[in-house]
Interface confidence: medium
């Protein structure tokens, strides 16, 4: 599923050809139906202010690589979503790079700040992973690891709209070291603060840190799953949590290996390999159908690690919702 979005080729990071990331590969978006509402959501996701235009992606150099795929045929946002991933999308079926979508957001001068509050994750793969930097008096500063905690990371991830914080031992690699002044250390967050600037900290600019102590944070969308409608937590219709919304999973390609991963993830033992009839006794779901064509090897620890179509892409009805029965 798309895990990142960026604008490429513009003079600043808030304008350019739209590219999305899927399985580590960046691809473009076809401009079918692409309009100012879609750009508004994209600008919001990137922290680039209001939408100012829907220029063609073809305008921006260098052009998309020939081997680079067009990943999305069309995007349809209402304009209120926080991310493109929350908008209705169609998988690509017929689009060339001459039809790549572009976007332009307002205020390039302040476009290097992903959110108004002035915090960003720099030099990472996308805006939800990277070195923590905070803006103070129009200057970006790095944050020292001394006193940093997962609670502080939670605040940053929430502030950036990037989901939950991931516990990571990753340090800033040499080429990602900061070159800016070191802002502060001894961050003391409870985890409930709205912004990192709300957390108590040591004095501004007064520390003995160096840049190999810069803080690295990684966030990811919350992912969870559950079985509903059964007699216990280990049987029922499968629902997955994505972007804060529960939705069902289509049974196309679903089989024993997929069952096993779900049971394993839930700590529910092994799959009882229910019959088609048994699977149908939990009834159809309502709302979003999040996943389709899920393919697991059986070795995965989480359904999230299995291959599947883009989130929200499917050709299913709720009559095809997957149900799973585990040994408990």
């Amino acid at each position: 599923s798309p895990s990142g979005v960026r604008l490429v080729g513009g003079l600043h990071r808030c304008e350019g050809r739209v590219e999305v990331e899927q399985k580590g590969q960046w691809g473009t978006v076809c401009d079918d139906g692409w309009d100012i509402k879609d750009v508004a959501v994209l600008c919001r996701e990137l922290g680039c202010g209001a939408a100012s235009g829907t220029p063609s992606g073809i305008l921006y150099e260098p052009p998309a690589e020939k081997e680079q795929k067009v990943l999305i045929q069309s995007v349809s946002c209402t304009g209120t979503e926080d991310t493109l991933a929350q908008c209705e999308q169609e998988e690509v079926y017929d689009c060339s790079h001459d039809e790549d979508a572009g976007a332009s957001c307002e205020n390039p001068e302040s476009s290097f700040s992903p959110v108004p509050e002035g915090v960003r994750l720099a030099d990472g793969p996308g805006h939800c992973k990277g070195r923590v930097e905070v803006k103070h008096q129009n200057q970006w500063y790095t944050v020292c690891q001394t006193g940093w905690s997962l609670r502080a990371a939670k605040v940053v991830c929430r502030q950036l709209g990037c989901g939950r914080a991931v516990l990571t031992q990753k340090r800033c690699n040499k080429h990602a070291y900061g070159r800016k002044p070191i802002w502060l250390s001894q961050m003391s967050c409870s985890g409930r603060e709205a912004t990192l600037q709300d957390c108590p900290s040591g004095p501004w600019g007064k520390n003995t840190c160096n840049h190999d102590e810069d803080t690295w944070v990684e966030c990811e969308d919350p992912f969870d799953l559950r079985l509903v409608g059964g007699d216990n937590l280990c049987s029922g219709r499968l629902e997955v949590l994505h972007k804060g919304v529960w939705g069902s999973v289509c049974d196309d390609n679903w089989g024993e290996k997929e069952d096993q991963v779900v049971c394993k993830q839930l700590g529910c033992g092994k799959s009882l390999s229910p019959s088609f009839r048994d699977r149908k006794c939990y009834g159809p779901g309502v709302g979003r159908i999040w996943l389709d064509n899920v393919r697991c090897s059986g070795e995965e620890q989480s359904l999230e690690q299995c291959q599947h179509r883009f989130w929200g892409f499917h050709d299913c009805t709720h009559q095809e919702d997957v149900a799973v029965i585990c040994s408990g």
């Epitope: 304008e15 401009d31 235009g53 220029p55 921006y60 150099e61 001459d98 390039p108």
Partner: antibody, heavy 116, light 108 residues
Framework: QSLEESGGRLVTPGGSLTLTCTVS????????MGWVRQAPGKGLEWIGV?????GTVYASWAKGRFTISKTSTTVDLKMTSPTPEDTATYFC?????????????WGQGTLVTISS | ELVLTQTPASVSEPVGGTVTIKCQAS??????LAWYQQKPGQPPKLLIY???TLESGVPSRFSGSGSGTEFTLTISDLECADAATYYC??????????FGGGTEVVVK
């Protein structure tokens, strides 16, 4: 290779007017095309461009007031509710390629006068 | 919106002289700047693009330099035919397409 603008005339404020740029010897699927205007005795003013796939970009002041469209041989500029300040010579221009670029071929321009 | 400020507004130099016109951008535009020459009653003519690349057919007496926010057009060995108004133009991005106010060059 040439560009020729037409449609310029005297229009009353609040009316609507479409200018047409007819291209000769130019494949519009290979070039970004733009419109620029020049009020009498004044400097050049960038209005907007249309990309090879029909996507348009306008100057902030021109959004909602101008619409650029094209066929295989023409590029149109539609003006809605013009005011006397829109009185100018309107030039059609060809970009140097598919991307944002300078304009390396210009039409002679067509004069639009907005007056009651 | 980007603003391009051209100086001077007018300059007068004798035949054989040199004219220097400056163009300052309100934000960095890399090398995405062009220079045009316009004579009365005619459309503009592209002289230089990408800040310093001479358009085909333009005499080498015209040269451009600069990048970022500061750009210069230099006309050396001035000829009578160089009398015209010169404009700079930035041309990259939705909010960065603009023309400078123009510089009138008078050849004495």
């Amino acid at each position: 290779q040439s560009l020729e603008e037409s449609g310029g005339r005297l229009v009353t404020p609040g009316g609507s007017l479409t200018l047409t740029c007819t291209v000769s010897g130019i494949d519009l699927s290979s070039y970004t095309m733009g419109w620029v205007r020049q009020a009498p005795g004044k400097g050049l003013e960038w209005i907007g461009v249309i990309a090879i796939n029909g996507g348009t970009v306008y100057a902030s002041w021109a959004k909602g007031r101008f619409t650029i469209s094209k066929t295989s041989t023409t590029v149109d500029l539609k003006m809605t509710s013009p005011t006397p300040e829109d009185t100018a010579t309107y030039f059609c221009a060809r970009g140097a390629g598919k991307t944002w670029s300078s304009f390396n071929l210009w039409g002679q321009g067509t004069l639009v006068t907005i007056s009651s | 919106e980007l603003v391009l400020t051209q100086t001077p507004a007018s300059v007068s130099e004798p035949v054989g002289g040199t004219v220097t016109i400056k163009c300052q951008a309100s934000q960095s535009i890399g090398s995405n700047l062009a220079w045009y020459q316009q004579k009365p009653g005619q459309p503009p003519k592209l002289l230089i693009y990408r800040a310093s690349t001479l358009e085909s057919g333009v005499p080498s007496r015209f040269s451009g330099s600069g990048s970022g926010t500061e750009f210069t057009l230099t006309i050396s060995d001035l000829e009578c035919a160089d009398a015209a108004t010169y404009y700079c133009q930035s041309y990259y991005g939705s909010s960065t397409n603009a023309f400078g106010g123009g510089t009138e060059v008078v050849v004495k």
